[in-house]
C-alpha cells in the first residue's frame, strides 16, 4: 500500500487556446484530472487501473502552482493503491477549461480540452521527486511525482507491513526495510522474549518483562539460584528444592520439633500446663474455661451460634443473651413477624410461606444457610478435623491443618514414630498418642534405650533367711552367702531338713 | 448536444476492403476515447476496439487484430474503422461509441450504427 | 477470451424493483473490471447507463444503479416504469479489451 505523489508546479498556456486550436472565452480557467495506470510501452485508452484524481480551478491561462501540502491542500496530489507497486506505470495528465464551477464533463463546454500530456516509466518507492516537464504544441507543464509507502507499509514495493508496537504481541519498531527493530529488553523473532535480568538462572528463572527475574518453583533468590526448603521447613536446609535436612537439635518431617518443645516454645497459652508428650510432641493441660491445642480458646456458651435468623450473641456470666434483629423475637430470636412479603431471604434465597402466611421458610442456595440465608456455609463447624487439627475454610472446600504426629485429610492417620526404629539396642517401640515409648532390654535405659547400665542382681533381694547377696559383675548374676544353719543356692532350707521333692 | 453521426449503409463484394465513419460533436473530440462495436443479427454486441484520439493509441480485440483498422482525423473530429478481406461473417450493424478512462469507460453515447452488407 | 453471461430474459411490472446481473467466466467480477451497462431500444438506440460499476452516466434517470453482489454485476431498476423495456448489455474489462455478454431482454407488464 502506497501514493503516487504529484505535484503540480507551473503551467504556461500563453496564447490561452484549446487543444482544437479555438481560443477560451474569456481565458482558459484550467483544471486537471489526472490518470494513472499500469506500465503501457504505447499509451493507449482504458480504465485508469491505479487511480484517477482532479483538481478544481487552479488558474487562468498561464499559472505557477503553490505547493498546498502544509495547509491541507490538495498539491501535491494523492493517488493511493493498496497494491504491491510494480515499480512501472503510466500517468496522463488532461487540462481542461471550465468557464462556471462545475466541473462535471457534462457541465462542460462542447469545445473543453486545453491539453493531454502522458508519460509512462519505471519509478521506484522513495522519498526524491523526479521533475519533469512536459511541452505540446502550445502549452508547457512543469510538474514532479514520486512514490511513498502507506503508514506501516515499507520495502522497495511497499508490499511488507509492519506496525510499530509494544504490547503483548511485540516490543518493536520498524526499520525502512521492514524488518522489526526490538525495543531495548527485548529478543526473538518478533521481540516478544524479555531478556531477563542479568545472572538469572537458565534453568531456575524466567521473566515476563525486562531486567526481571522471576523463580521458577522451588527458587528463590535475586538470581534463582537458592533452593526452596520444603514449606513449613523451620530448622533446617535444602540443597534441591522442597528438602528439610535438620539442624542439629531438631527433628521431624519439617524440623520443627524439639526435644525440649514446652520450654523451649511455650506453646500452651492461658496458664496451662505444658508437658512433653515424646520427642517432637507436647500436650497442653488447659485450666477450666479454656480448650483448644494450645488451650488458646476461650470457652464460650456462644460458640454454639444458638441465636437464629441473625441474632447476635452475646456472654452473659450465667449464661448468653441474643440480640435479635427487626422482625424477630424469642430467646434464640426464632419467632419471626415477618412473612415472605417483606424479602426476608438474603443471598438469592427463595421464600416458602408456611402457617397460612404467619411464618415463612426460606430455602438457601448453595453455599448459604441460617434460616433468611444469612450466613456463608463454615465447613468447619462440624469440627471435621481429628487428632486435634485445626480445620480452615478455603472458599467452596476446606482443609486440615493437622498437628505434629498425625497426617491424612482430616488428620486421622497417625503417623508411626516407631516406623524409624528409634529404640536402641534391641528396645522394643510402642507408638503412643501424643510420640512413641521404648522398652529397654536388661542393661539399657534411657528414652531411646541409649544407656548402657550395670545390672544390680541383688536389687531384687534374691536371698533368704538373712544371707548376704553379692554380684558378679562378669556375669550379671548374684551369689547368696549362707549364714549358718541354712543351705541351697538362695539359703533356702534349714540344714538337717533335705528339701521335699514331690516323688 | 453530443451527437455521433455515423456514415451510411455499404454492400460490399467478399474480399473488398470498406472505410466507415463516425463524425462527433458537441463535446472535445480528443478527450474521449472512441469505441466501435459490432452487432450481427440485430442481437448480441462484440466489441471490436477503441482509440484514443489525443495521442492516437489503440486496443483491439484480439479476434479482429489484421481484420479492423482504427483512425482518426482530429481536425474534423471524425473516427473512422476500415474493414479489410471482407466476407459475408462481416455482414454487420457497426457501432461507433465514446467513452471516457476517468469514470470506468462509461459507453454513454452511441452513433446510429452502419449496416455493411458483403454478398457477391 | 473471457464469456460474459446475462439472464436472457426477465418479466417486471411497473413500480417493481428488478435486478438484472452480469457473470464472468473467470471468476467473480471485481471494481477492476469496470462493469458497464448499456440499454438498446428499439430502432438501434443505444444509451450508456453505468460506468465503472456504478457511476451513472449524465441524464440516467436514479432509479438505474450499478453495484456488486456476490460474485457477479449488477444492474438495479428500481421502481421499473414502461419506457424501461429494452435490452441491457452489460460489457466487463479485462487488462486491455472489453468483453460484451449476450444481453437481457426486460419486459415491463403495462
Known amino acids: 500500500s502506497g501514493v503516487f505523489q504529484l505535484q503540480l508546479q507551473e503551467f504556461i498556456n500563453e496564447r490561452g487556446v484549446l487543444a482544437s486550436g479555438r481560443p477560451c472565452e474569456p481565458g482558459c480557467r484550467t483544471f486537471f484530472r489526472v490518470c494513472l495506470k499500469h506500465f503501457q510501452a504505447v499509451v493507449s485508452p482504458g480504465p485508469c487501473t491505479f487511480g484517477t484524481v482532479s483538481t478544481p480551478v487552479l488558474g487562468t491561462n498561464s499559472f505557477a502552482v503553490r505547493d498546498d501540502s502544509s495547509g491541507g491542500g490538495r498539491n501535491p496530489l494523492q493517488l493511493p493503491f493498496n497494491f504491491t507497486w510494480p515499480g512501472t506505470f503510466s500517468l496522463i495528465i488532461e487540462a481542461w477549461h471550465a468557464p462556471g464551477d462545475d466541473l462535471r464533463p457534462e457541465a462542460l463546454p462542447p469545445d473543453a480540452l486545453i491539453s493531454k500530456i502522458a508519460i509512462q516509466g519505471s519509478l521506484a518507492v522513495g522519498q526524491n521527486w523526479l521533475l519533469d516537464e512536459q511541452t505540446s504544441t502550445l502549452t508547457r507543464l512543469r510538474y514532479s511525482y514520486r512514490v511513498i509507502c502507506s503508514d506501516n507499509y515499507y520495502g522497495d514495493n511497499c508490499s511488507r507491513l509492519c506496525k510499530k508496537r509494544n504490547d503483548h504481541f511485540g516490543h518493536y519498531v520498524c526499520q525502512p526495510d521492514g524488518n522489526l527493530s526490538c525495543l531495548p529488553g527485548w529478543t526473538g523473532e518478533y521481540c516478544q522474549q524479555p531478556i531477563c535480568l542479568s545472572g538469572c538462572h537458565e534453568q531456575n528463572g524466567y521473566c515476563s518483562k525486562p531486567a526481571e527475574c522471576l523463580c521458577r518453583p522451588g527458587w528463590q533468590g535475586r538470581l534463582c539460584n537458592e533452593c526452596i526448603p520444603h514449606n513449613g521447613c523451620r530448622h533446617g536446609t535444602c540443597s534441591t528444592p522442597w528438602q528439610c535436612t535438620c539442624d542439629e537439635g531438631w527433628g521431624g518431617l519439617f524440623c520443627d520439633q524439639d526435644l525440649n518443645y514446652c520450654t523451649h516454645h511455650s506453646p500452651c497459652k492461658n496458664g496451662a500446663t505444658c508437658s512433653n508428650s515424646g520427642q517432637r510432641s507436647y500436650t497442653c493441660t488447659c485450666r477450666p474455661g479454656y480448650t483448644g491445642v494450645d488451650c488458646e480458646l476461650e470457652l464460650s456458651e456462644c460458640d454454639s451460634n444458638p441465636c437464629r435468623n441473625g441474632g447476635s450473641c452475646k456472654d452473659q456470666e450465667d449464661g448468653y443473651h441474643c440480640l435479635c434483629p427487626p422482625g424477630y423475637y424469642g430467646l434464640h430470636c426464632e419467632h419471626s413477624t415477618l412473612s415472605c412479603a417483606d424479602s426476608p431471604c438474603f443471598n438469592g434465597g427463595s421464600c416458602r410461606e408456611r402457617n397460612q402466611g404467619a411464618n415463612y421458610a426460606c430455602e438457601c442456595p448453595p453455599n448459604f444457610t441460617g434460616s433468611n440465608c444469612e450466613k456463608k456455609v463454615d465447613r468447619c463447624t462440624s469440627n471435621p478435623c481429628a487428632n486435634g487439627g485445626q480445620c480452615l475454610n478455603r472458599g467452596p472446600s476446606r482443609m486440615c491443618r493437622c498437628r505434629p504426629g498425625f497426617t491424612g485429610t482430616y488428620c486421622e492417620l497417625h503417623v508411626s514414630d516407631c516406623a524409624r526404629n528409634p529404640c536402641a539396642h534391641g528396645g522394643t517401640c510402642h507408638d503412643l498418642e501424643n510420640g512413641l515409648m521404648c522398652t529397654c532390654p536388661a542393661g539399657f535405659s534411657g528414652r531411646r534405650c541409649e544407656v548402657r547400665t550395670s545390672i544390680d542382681a541383688c536389687a531384687s533381694s534374691p536371698c533368704f533367711n538373712r544371707a548376704t547377696c553379692y554380684t558378679d559383675l562378669s556375669t550379671d548374676t548374684f551369689v547368696c552367702n549362707c549364714p549358718y544353719g541354712f543351705v541351697g543356692s538362695r539359703c533356702e532350707f534349714p540344714v538337717g531338713l533335705p528339701p521335699s521333692f514331690p516323688w | 448536444e453530443v451527437q455521433l453521426q455515423q456514415s451510411g449503409p455499404e454492400l460490399e463484394k467478399p474480399g473488398a476492403s470498406v472505410k466507415i465513419s463516425c463524425k462527433a460533436s458537441?463535446?472535445?473530440?480528443?478527450?474521449?476515447?472512441m469505441n466501435w462495436v459490432k452487432q450481427s443479427n440485430g442481437k448480441s454486441l462484440e466489441w471490436i476496439g477503441n482509440?484514443?484520439?489525443?495521442?492516437?493509441?489503440?486496443n483491439y480485440n484480439q479476434k479482429f487484430k489484421g481484420k479492423a483498422t482504427l483512425t482518426v482525423d482530429k481536425s474534423s473530429s471524425t473516427a473512422y474503422m476500415q474493414l479489410k478481406s471482407l466476407t459475408s461473417e462481416d455482414s454487420a450493424v457497426y457501432y461507433c461509441?465514446?467513452?471516457?478512462?476517468?469514470?470506468?469507460?462509461?459507453?454513454?453515447?452511441w452513433g446510429q450504427g452502419t449496416t455493411l452488407t458483403v454478398s457477391s | 477470451q473471457a464469456v460474459v453471461t446475462q439472464e436472457s430474459a426477465l418479466t417486471t411490472s411497473p413500480g417493481e424493483t428488478v435486478t438484472l446481473t452480469c457473470r464472468s467466466s473467470?471468476?467473480?467480477?471485481?471494481?477492476?473490471?469496470?462493469a458497464n451497462w448499456v440499454q438498446e431500444k428499439p430502432d438501434h438506440l443505444f444509451t450508456g447507463l453505468i460506468g465503472?460499476?456504478?457511476n451513472r452516466a449524465p441524464g440516467v434517470p436514479a432509479r438505474f444503479s450499478g453495484s456488486l453482489i456476490g460474485d457477479k454485476a449488477a444492474l438495479t431498476i428500481t421502481g421499473a416504469q414502461t419506457e424501461d423495456e429494452a435490452i441491457y448489455f452489460c460489457?466487463?474489462?479485462?487488462?486491455?479489451?472489453?468483453?460484451f455478454g449476450g444481453g437481457t431482454k426486460l419486459t415491463v407488464l403495462g
Open positions: 461509441a465514446r467513452n471516457y478512462d476517468y469514470d470506468g469507460g462509461c459507453f454513454d453515447y
Open positions: 482509440i484514443d484520439p489525443y495521442f492516437g493509441g489503440t
Open positions: 473467470t471468476g467473480a467480477v471485481t471494481t477492476s473490471n469496470y
Open positions: 460489457a466487463l474489462w479485462y487488462s486491455n479489451h472489453w468483453v
Open positions: 465503472g460499476t456504478n
Open positions: 458537441g463535446y472535445s473530440f480528443t478527450g474521449y476515447n
